[in-house]
Every structure is written in C-alpha cells, then in structure tokens.
Interface confidence: low
Amino acid sequence: AWELTILHTNDVHSRLEQTSEDSSKCVNASRCMGGVARLFTKVQQIRRAEPNVLLLDAGDQYQGTIWFTVYKGAEVAHFMNALRYDAMALGNHEFDNGVEGLIEPLLKEAKFPILSANIKAKGPLASQISGLYLPYKVLPVGDEVVGIVGYTSKETPFLSNPGTNLVFEDEITALQPEVDKLKTLNVNKIIALGHSGFEMDKLIAQKVRGVDVVVGGHSNTFLYTGNPPSKEVPAGKYPFIVTSDDGRKVPVVQAYAFGKYLGYLKIEFDERGNVISSHGNPILLNSSIPEDPSIKADINKWRIKLDNYSTQELGKTIVYLDGSSQSCRFRECNMGNLICDAMINNNLRHTDEMFWNHVSMCILNGGGIRSPIDERNNGTITWENLAAVLPFGGTFDLVQLKGSTLKKAFEHSVHRYGQSTGEFLQVGGIHVVYDLSRKPGDRVVKLDVLCTKCRVPSYDPLKMDEVYKVILPNFLANGGDGFQMIKDELLRHDSGDQDINVVSTYISKMKVIYPAVEGRIKFSTGSH
C-alpha cells in the first residue's frame, strides 16, 4: 500500500493576511486565523512529518480584498509560489479581470501547473494561451506518479469575464477523455481538482470513470468528521464518500473558504491504484499555529502599497451620497441606488442575443449601508470612504429565486417598518410600492421588475412562478436580517466579487457620479 497526503485550499479569495473568525479584517491578532504565513507554517510542518504530500488549490484565489484590487493577481502567483503549491485549478473568479488579467499576473508567473480540462480556447487566444494552463498534469510524488485533472464551473461566462474565445464545456463530458488518457499513460492514481461546487464534485465522483479522489471548491462547503472546531456547520462528513457508477468509493473533499482551514486528507492506495482507505479533516488555522516569520515579513512589505492606495481618489461625486440610517432604513436612498447600480454594472454579461443582460435586479439591506459620503470634500471618493460605507468585507452574489420568494422578501422588508431596522431593502431594476396601512405580510401592492429577455428594458409585473436572477449581498443570500426565505428557497447561489471592489470599480469607470432618488421605492395608501 502507498499513502498520499493531500493538503488543499479553495476559495481563498485574496485573504493573504490573517482574518477574524468570520474572515473579515483582523482586529484582535490573538484571535485571528488563516493567512498565507500561518498556512505555510502548517504546510511545512506536514511536509516534514509525512513522505508523500501534495498541496493543491481548487480555484478562486482571485477577488475578495484590497490585495486583489491593487495587485490584480500578482500577489496570488507570488505567495502561492512561496508556499510551493503543487497544482491549482482555475476558478470562475480567476477571469474577473478578463483573460489578460489571468495570463499576465498568474499563468505566466506561476511555478506550478494551473489546470482546467473543460475550458477550450479558440480563435487568436488559442495560440496565445497554449500551454499556460493544462487539462491535466502528472506529478511525481515520492516514487509514484499522481495525475491531477482540472475543471472549472461552466457557469463562468455568467459569473465572470472570460471573453468570447474561451468555451466552457460540461465538466463530466470534458473530464472523461482526459482521465482515459491518463489511464493509457499508466497513471493509476487520479485526483480531480476543480471549481464547480459540491453538487458537481459529487457528480464527478459518481460519473467520471477512473477518478479516485475529488478535491473541490466554489460552494464554500465545510465538511468535518466529529465536533467542528469553529462556527462553520458541516454539510457532511470529511471526506464525503460517493459510490461511483462502477461501484468504487470515491472521497470528495472541500475546505470551506478564505484560507481559514487547510484541508487534510490521507489516502491509501493499493498497488493497482485503488483507494483502500481515506480519512482526515480540515485543520483550523487558528492562532495556536504561528505565522511563518519570513512569509509574514514579505506580506508586510507588500502591504505598504495597499495603505497608499486606500487614500487615492477613485472618482468624484457631485451630490451628497446619503448613506444615513435615517434614509436607507426608511426610504429609497441614493447611496443604495449607487451601490445597486454598481452591482448590476459589475454583472453585465452579453452572452445571448435574446437578453440585453442575464440579470437586471439588485436588492440590498439598508442596514448594510453604514455611512454617507459628503460631496463637499472636493467630491473626492477614496477606498477608505467606501470601506466606511461597506465595512463588513462581504461579497455581492448572484442568486436565482422564484418570484414568490422575492415577494416574501419585500414583505419582510417592511413587516416592522418604522423601527430603523436593517431589513428595509434598497433596490435596482425593481419598482416597489408599499401600502403601510395594510397588515404586515400584505403591504406590497406593486412589484415590477426590469425585463432581461428584451432589447429595450422595461418594467413588467413580477411573476410568482418565474425564476429570476438577482444580485444581492452574501449576507442576504445566507438569510441575514431575517431573510430566511432567501436562504431556504434560493435555487442557485454563486458567490461574487468583494463589495467595496464592485463599487470602487464602478466609480472609477464613471469618473463622476450623481445618483438620485428616482422613485424605485414608493409608498401609497388605499387601493391599487
């Protein structure tokens, strides 16, 4: 028997520095977690103690903090090289700055293979990107070889900016021939490493013949056997065992997100490459693990540029950006409109001639808007200003909801109106009329939504059984501010870009902004 240790991360999302327990900015260092310096300590400890170790990343290193905003992926290549990752799969967020924003900072600089079997380049890009990412890689580990085959969510064109010269194929269809190829090369230990979410990970384990282990990402899935060490609630045991269609037991793993845990899986193979046993657990990277001093020093050196960036002007406002709670928790506020407009703008993807865009709607809890921005400071808007407005380090995510769920959400928005509570919704691509004289749960008298399947966008009545795409904060997608119906009834959830980054990019693009209060949210009395 031959034993392999797989160390894995996924959805790190730019958390190069240690973070608080909820993966936001580290405040009290003695209680902070994760970060590449601490990760390196643990990885090196395991590498010294065990013979056959692979360090893998399942995608979405890009996007999530000011590190990515400023360094645009160069930081990912630099620190992943420093940690000596063995392989990485491409995630959807790796395309956030377009193909060029992937090629130059990461693909050309990485000293490890970057993989995806289901992304096919065409046209002029094919020769430009050739060899910079691979469908699979055979890695020597000790005196054996292990095949790693990559995959990426086929939804990436809707979630990021891969352009028109990359085709995202069905994962299972694309993986099978690559695994078959590895088999003909006498590689009998094969890991599928990819970024399509836990449901697809399980399907790959079930359907792709010859895959021995699946290491996934995208869905931020936390798996754990025994008592979990922090706040995350396990979605299942670690590893999650799937019985394949040909009768094998295939371990599937994921390690939550944000570099908070290091996935740790031990696999025992027989001489024919069959998995005999698998066990392990994610390791919580808490303050009991010291940060490696050399990596930490490097982080501090790279940090200097970030501090300078946060005070630079991104753009100007010529109007007061009213992010006050007395506005945003009671009525339409122009800061809410600005943020929602930025959220939609960030999700412009013209992928089909039938649609002007794949999503037109935004909702945003008023309680998530924490500060106004005064235009009398020469109109200047900085990252620092935006960090005061959006201090929680969240993301703006894409969900799919039925109209009936949206209707419930808008009823919840005003079910206890007048108490300055955070659930009052700011909107984009939505016209809502409330009648507060009616009883809670029956106060939405008009709800019109902007069509997407149209060449001239206009507002149509919400249909209860229609499925709609909506951009919203991850806080709401997770049921925050009492929006349990969103969490319980959402049909799909894809994590998006860092909230401040979305707004800062929009302001930089627009240069001068002047959001208005324009009748997106109205109040009426009497019949409709």
Partner: antibody, heavy 121, light 107 residues
C-alpha cells in the same frame, strides 16, 4: 421554418413509464422554453410543465410533480417529457409547445404535432 | 391555482355572424392571457396573446379584450374555416391553466 417534431405513438401498460421527444428546428433551441401540454380524447388542454433549455431549469404543475420529468439535450435540440407510474387516465395526446419569453409577451406560438400515448393493460 | 372558466362551452353560429367567447379567471391574471384555436386531430394554433395582441398571420376579424379576471375573444364575421374549438390560457402564475374550451359549430 420553425417547427417541433415529436416522436411516434406509444402503447404502455399501467405502472410503466413513457418518454416522448420533441425535436426543434428553425430557431435557437436554447432561447425559448419548451412546454408540455396534454389532451385526453374529447377533453380540454392541460399544462404539465416547462424547461428552459439554456440552463435546464424546469417547472411542473403540482398535479404532475414527482411523476413527470422534463429534460433536454441541447446538442441535438431536443426536449423530452417522461411520465412515470402510468394509469389509464394518462391516455392522451401529448404536445410540446414553444413558449415565447421575449419582453414578457408570453404564449405558446409553435406546437408539435402531438404524440398519442395509450395506457392499457 | 387560478381556474379558467370559459363560456359558453358550445355555440352554434352561421357564416357572417359576430361571435363572442368569454373567459373568466378565478384571480387577476393581469392581461397575461392567450387564445388558441384547435381543429380536430390538430395541435392548437395561437390567435392572440397579452389578452389583445393579434398573433402573426391571424386575420383581423379576431380580436381580444378584457382585464383583471374577465376576458373575451370576438370574431367579427365568422368564416367557414373558423368553426373549431377555442381555448383561453393564462400565464400569470403556474400552473398555466387553460379554459375548458368553447366548441363553435355551424348552425
């Protein structure tokens, strides 16, 4: 021209399943919903469910929930309706129909020729 | 679920007559209503949608009106090819139910 062509008549025993196909041509298959509607002899039309071929999203009438499965194969521009646990009252002509979804102007503008399914012991 | 009730269920008329068929929904369907014509052994054919918009290629003698829960299909001057069964269907919230049909026969 735009058309939907359905598979041929089927005779099934109670308790069995039937799978009817609907091949689209003359338009972009992934841009329109395909719906399924049935009509028992001498009776009215009954809507069963829909699929949006682009992403495979489906919606079913509560009456058929759990018994009907609508799928698609985009590579051959074909939608399928499978009805399980057949009973004699499922004897009907089954139609597929394209639903326009442009700008909220909703209607079934193109229909298949119909597939007769007979359930008999 | 919204139920659609059509009346009359059958009706005899002569060529040249003006004919009106009504469709009542059990709830407001906000003009999301279509009308179809079906001849024996054939698939239904779209006549009108959004309650009053004539489908492509449909003669102008067919018209639709109504709002809220009550809708009508009118044939201003019956032609021999109009003898068929007519159905309304709403598209407000699923299930997208059809009316029971109105059989229009030659007097």
């Amino acid at each position: 021209q735009v058309q939907l062509v359905q598979s041929g008549a089927e005779v099934k025993k109670p308790g069995a399943s039937v799978k009817v196909s609907c091949k689209a041509s003359g338009y972009t298959f992934t841009s329109y919903d395909i719906n399924w509607v049935r009509q028992a002899t001498g009776q009215g039309l009954e809507w069963m469910g829909w699929i949006y071929p682009r992403d495979g999203f489906t919606g079913y009438a509560q009456k058929f929930q759990g018994r009907v499965t609508i799928t698609r194969n985009t590579s051959i521009s074909t939608a399928y309706m499978e009805l399980s646990s057949l009973r004699s009252e499922d004897t009907a002509v089954y139609y597929c129909a394209r639903k326009e979804g442009y700008r909220g102007d909703w209607y079934f503008d193109v229909w298949g020729q119909g597939t007769t399914v007979t359930v008999s012991s | 679920d919204i139920q659609m009730t059509q009346s009359p269920s059958s009706l005899s008329a002569s060529v040249g007559d003006r004919v009106t068929i009504t469709c009542r929904a059990s709830g407001n369907v906000h003009n999301y209503l279509a009308w179809y014509q079906q001849k024996p052994g054939k698939a239904p054919k779209l006549l009108l949608y959004n309650a009053k918009t004539l489908a492509s290629g449909v003669p102008s003698r067919f018209s639709g009106s109504g709002s809220g829960t009550d809708y009508t299909l009118t044939i201003s001057s019956l032609q021999p090819e109009d003898f068929a069964t007519y159905y309304c269907q709403h598209f407000w919230s699923t299930p997208w139910t059809f009316g029971g049909g109105t059989e229009l026969e030659i007097k």
